[in-house]
Amino acid sequence: GSGIFQLRLQEFVNQRGMLANGQSCEPGCRTFFRICLKHFQATFSEGPCTFGNVSTPVLGTNSFVVRDKNSGSGRNPLQLPFNFTWPGTFSLNIQAWHTPGDDLRPETSPGNSLISQIIIQGSLAVGKIWRTDEQNDTLTRLSYSYRVICSDNYYGESCSRLCKKRDDHFGHYECQPDGSLSCLPGWTGKYCDQPICLSGCHEQNGYCSKPDECICRPGWQGRLCNECIPHNGCRHGTCSIPWQCACDEGWGGLFCDQDLNYCTHHSPCKNGSTCSNSGPKGYTCTCLPGYTGEHCELGLSKCASNPCRNGGSCKDQENSYHCLCPPGYYGQHCEHSTLTCADSPCFNGGSCRERNQGSSYACECPPNFTGSNCEKKVDRCTSNPCANGGQCQNRGPSRTCRCRPGFTGTHCELHISDCARSPCAHGGTCHDLENGPVCTCPAGFSGRRCEVRITHDACASGPCFNGATCYTGLSPNNFVCNCPYGFVGSRCEFPVGLPPSFPWVAVSLGVGLVVLLVLLVMVVVAVRQLRLRRPDDESREAMNNLSDFQKDNLIPAAQLKNTNQKKELEVDCGLDKSNCGKLQNHTLDYNLAPGLLGRGGMPGKYPHSDKSLGEKVPLRLHSEKPECRISAICSPRDSMYQSVCLISEERNECVIATEV
């Protein structure tokens, strides 16, 4: 039940041992009580004891004191449990009876006689305090007290509030006197089922399943989950946001696995050879004469240095070598010639000059050729002139150094720090990436250098008709209307349905003219594209000669670092496919979409953990397909900007990045 009415019998006095009918009990009145508790009645009437009834065993003869007894027969106080909301009012009938029979169950005995009865009507609030009373009539006196208390787990003024203390998965609390929950230490929430995490545990990056715990969400670590975890493939780098790989000093490459100071750290070159921090392994050894091998670890034979000139063949001898000269040559190294200009000894277009009155000659070689007979092609890369891992390329009469990202100069000797010239306008934050600066713009600005002030949302004016969906375009003032079935036009303003009398002839002529016009435009574009297209080698050769402005328009794969979920990047450049491609498994930083930050949409969320992506709020485009590939259309290769579609970490959502 929800509560208990308790009645404590204290003393009964019947000095003369009389019954209610005036007769006396023989030998004395063996007294027991019947109690009936019912709803409040102004006039007590017979009928069921609606709130409960109880009988006692024989408690004494004539006059006696009733002792408290907690268990067994004759329990005192008497308990009348109820299973409803206590109304606050009641009627109580206490009857004293005499039994000639059984002491323990006298109510069932025949020949019982009423001694006296009392009736109490009134109000009674739930509480622990006993209300004491005494009732007298001409023959008897009864002293008693009573109260209403709530059963275990029931609380409140009417015992109607159930509260059972618990410490399990569903809650961790005790119950207040009014039935409200009192959370155990370390727990909070309406039902005390939310743990209070370790003090300082990061709100977004951390959570807990029990008090004073701080469990980190993917990508975060540490006691308070406020330190990021670098990318899985990262070798010598750190991070400022999860899965980043920012190289430690002296390391380079996408995963910071290229030692920019390999020579100093490892001294790989042997036998006095020269080490330079370049080449595919991060270093190159230039051997002294008489040594070879990747690390100049192998001693050469005496002939290894090719001492015989003019095609002479070398023979190793014990401590030296011997040159066997071809016809027309003599000397220790076959360096002297018996030929003259008359014998046309100069190869590869070399011109012959007579010397010593015609007894010998000298060849003047064209560019790219050398040797006494212009027989050798010049290799200008043998001296490893390119620093910092630059690649040397022979280019006709000269050579060029193709620098690794982050370096410039004729020999790649200069390190680029693009942020030094403060390229970001309007308080934008500059990030010095390997392939140039990237600006993170404050709210209200966009563009490569945060130079564009975002004026308004082009969709705010509701430009699309007939229930079409409006999407903001790639610049703040652009919009695109997605028309419902049956409507066309840039604003979906034209219905597709045909009118009853249709002017077929006029329409046919119109359509024909449009088709001709489209074909003409396609021919012009194709011709223009063919004229623009250059061979691969030529464009590669031009790489080092690009202006800074043009270089900024290139998107090297290594620059595309993503600190989130890595999806694929599609760039669609209209008809000119030569400058397009899909960059797969490369990663993109949020910062590559600076122009869109702070415009519409919700911050990215993990589904069950509120993992926020920070203050950056990218524009969202809905996509039907889970793989979500949206290609932004960009202009041909002579355009100023390339537009890029960045596939975000969320399922079914896209972010458009502009002006990379």
Epitope: Q221, E227, G233
Partner: antibody, heavy 118, light 107 residues
Framework: EVQLVESGGGLVQPGGSLRLSCAAS????????MAWVRQAPGKGLEWVAT????????YYRDSVKGRFTISRDNAKNSLYLQMNSLRAEDTAVYYC???????????WGQGTLVTVSS | DIQMTQSPSSLSASVGDRVTITCRAS??????LAWYQQKPGKSPKLLIF???DLADGVPSRFSGSGSGTDFTLTISSLQPEDFATYYC?????????FGQGTKLEIK
Amino acid sequence: EVQLVESGGGLVQPGGSLRLSCAASGFTFSNFPMAWVRQAPGKGLEWVATISSSDGTTYYRDSVKGRFTISRDNAKNSLYLQMNSLRAEDTAVYYCARGYYNSPFAYWGQGTLVTVSS
Amino acid sequence: DIQMTQSPSSLSASVGDRVTITCRASQDIYINLAWYQQKPGKSPKLLIFDTNDLADGVPSRFSGSGSGTDFTLTISSLQPEDFATYYCQQYDYVPPTFGQGTKLEIK
């Protein structure tokens, strides 16, 4: 090349102790969280413990809490697992791995066998 | 703990075959799932992380897909060196848990 080399495994009686070591090279050890993962003979993989790179915060699977202690020495590029009160069910090949409890394990050592038997 | 259930537990295939292994999580783990390859007597090797991202140096014939509770590892054209045991692992909840493994054998 990233290399993780475990040592310290062997035969030990139930209730005994063992200390496993892992020597790391080929990456900046102090920048990365580390873990121990074990594999009982003929069974699957089971994460044992993790330590963060930054402040040395540690986490353990319930069955080893209070018995195992993971630690690291960034100056020595080393990871350790102190195993006390060993039980028969701790018998496994113990792998040192680079990763946290909430990230994939990108690199693994060759493993060291711990046998708990009387 | 999150239970990871792989199916099948073993499978036989031939060189050149397209093979699919599935992994089911007992709760939503978003995309925080990795796949590993383990050859007898060797340590596991990370193949795929974040459900579909290839680890460094892993051939493109391996691919992953899925999200939430159901995930798939696909090998588009089996090579002789691909015969091994494959494990999935979730790292969305503590403790991180692995699947029981799928043994890929030569038919």
